[in-house]
């Protein structure tokens, strides 16, 4: 049961992380808490990739619920062997984990690109522009240049904070799904052969 317990632990963590990803992505649509920029299409192109909503969010809920379900005691066996069914379930969880890896990977890549390019903002010339796109992410180290964006208010801070959160959350999701790949492979091969004393406490 130890592999199932660990999977359940990972599953619950992923649900929380997925919800945080969705929330962070939604906030990107409302710079400074305002709706006008979304309606005027004055948002960074990478906001429209739905990396936190789809990649780190909805796509992550599928493996999360699969992992949570692995600890159920009424797991059906195959050919009358209950353990065989549990092994199959553990191995199938590897597929779910790979979906999670794809989703979290997408979230991480888009967040990194969003950070590197910087926000779409009304620049010092009065033009809606990717003011920091040519800096190759160097603007992140030079906060004195952030005032080049005159609108939305605090847009650089907003974008940097939320894309960084998405990057971190996606990274954690990626690691957890990777752990579950290993856990699932071990659980599938070894079966539920570990003793009752070897249970994970999560």
């Amino acid at each position: 049961m130890c592999y199932g317990k660990c999977a359940r632990c990972i599953g619950h963590s992923l649900v929380g992380l997925a919800l945080l990803c969705i929330a962070a992505n939604i906030l990107l649509y409302f710079p400074n808490g305002e709706t006008k920029y979304a309606s005027e299409n004055h948002l960074s192109r990478f906001v429209w990739f739905f990396s936190g909503i789809v990649g780190g969010g909805l796509l992550m809920l599928l493996p999360a619920f699969v992992f949570i379900g692995l600890e159920q005691d009424d797991c059906c066996g195959c050919c009358g062997h209950e353990n065989c069914g549990k092994r199959c379930a553990m191995l199938s969880s590897v597929l779910a984990a790979l979906i999670g890896i794809a989703g979290s990977g997408y979230c991480v890549i888009v967040a990194a690109l969003g950070l590197a390019e910087g926000p779409l903002c009304l620049d010092s010339l009065g033009q809606w522009n990717y003011t920091f796109a040519s800096t190759e992410g160097q603007y992140l180290l030079d906060t004195s240049t952030w005032s080049e964006c005159t609108e939305p208010k605090h847009i650089v801070e907003w974008n940097v904070s939320l894309f960084s959160i998405l990057l971190a959350l996606g990274g954690i999701e990626f690691i957890l799904c990777l752990i579950q790949v290993i856990n699932g492979v071990l659980g599938g091969i070894c079966g539920f052969c570990c003793s009752h004393q070897q249970q994970y406490d999560c």
Partner: antibody, heavy 120, light 106 residues
Framework: EVQLVQSGAEVKKPGASVKVSCKAS????????VKWVRQAPGQGLEWMGW????????IYAADFKGRVTMTTDTSTSTAYMELRSLRSDDTAVYYC?????????????WGQGTLVTVSS | EIVLTQSPATLSLSPGERATLSCRAQ?????INWYQQKPGQAPRLLIY???NLASGIPARFSGSGSGRDFTLTISSLEPEDFAVYYC?????????FGGGTKVEIK
């Protein structure tokens, strides 16, 4: 009618400060920026900077940084430009101008101008 | 900063004649605006984005050009057109104006 009405002429001593006001009417104040341009007697036009009236974020020309402050009061649709440490070469007519954002950026509505004379 | 050089500094013409004003940029720019200023008055926008006529401006005014060379043309001068004309660039900060071309009655 769309218009910008500026405060009256000022006479200041070198080292003093001047604050020029610019009241907008006939349009939504926060939909446009306000730029400040000055013109010394018999000379051309010089851009001083501009302020985003929606966010209050100003952008100053390098020549005026540290000496100029641009602010707005959205409740009265008024923009302000304060110039400190005045010198005799700051004697000029100061214009506030409505600034259209976008791919084509232009100054379509000008205030009547405020003459600031710096003399000891 | 991008320096704009206007030529000629003074243009002496008669009403009804065609006026061609030049504005040359130190380096390539996207667009320019043209303004007209009469003595004791604030400048007035004539042309924006190189070739677009501002609201309320007569069709005898037209703008053209690209890169470094831009032109304002007044097809047939009216008495009220005698004034100083400025070009202005907005491709980079600081925004700069040309030195002006004075169109005077010959």
């Amino acid at each position: 009618e769309v218009q910008l009405v500026q405060s009256g002429a000022e006479v200041k001593k070198p080292g003093a400060s001047v604050k020029v006001s610019c009241k907008a009417s006939g349009y939504t104040f926060t939909n446009y920026g306000v730029k400040w341009v000055r013109q010394a007697p018999g000379q051309g036009l010089e851009w001083m900077g501009w302020i985003n009236t929606y966010t209050g974020n100003p952008i100053y020309a390098a020549d005026f940084k540290g000496r100029v402050t641009m602010t707005t009061d959205t409740s009265t649709s008024t923009a302000y430009m304060e110039l400190r440490s005045l010198r005799s070469d700051d004697t000029a007519v100061y214009y506030c101008v409505r600034f259209q954002y976008g791919d084509y950026r232009y100054f379509d509505v000008w205030g009547q101008g405020t003459l600031v004379t710096v003399s000891s | 900063e991008i320096v704009l050089t206007q030529s000629p500094a003074t243009l002496s013409l008669s009403p009804g004649e065609r006026a061609t004003l030049s504005c040359r940029a130190q380096s390539g720019i996207s667009f320019i605006n043209w303004y007209q200023q009469k003595p004791g008055q604030a400048p007035r926008l004539l042309i924006y984005g190189t070739a677009n006529l501002a609201s309320g401006i007569p069709a005898r005014f037209s703008g053209s050009g690209s890169g470094r060379d831009f032109t304002l043309t007044i097809s047939s001068l009216e008495p009220e057109d005698f004034a100083v004309y400025y070009c202005q660039q907005y491709s980079s900060n600081p925004l700069t104006f040309g030195g002006g071309t004075k169109v005077e009655i010959k």
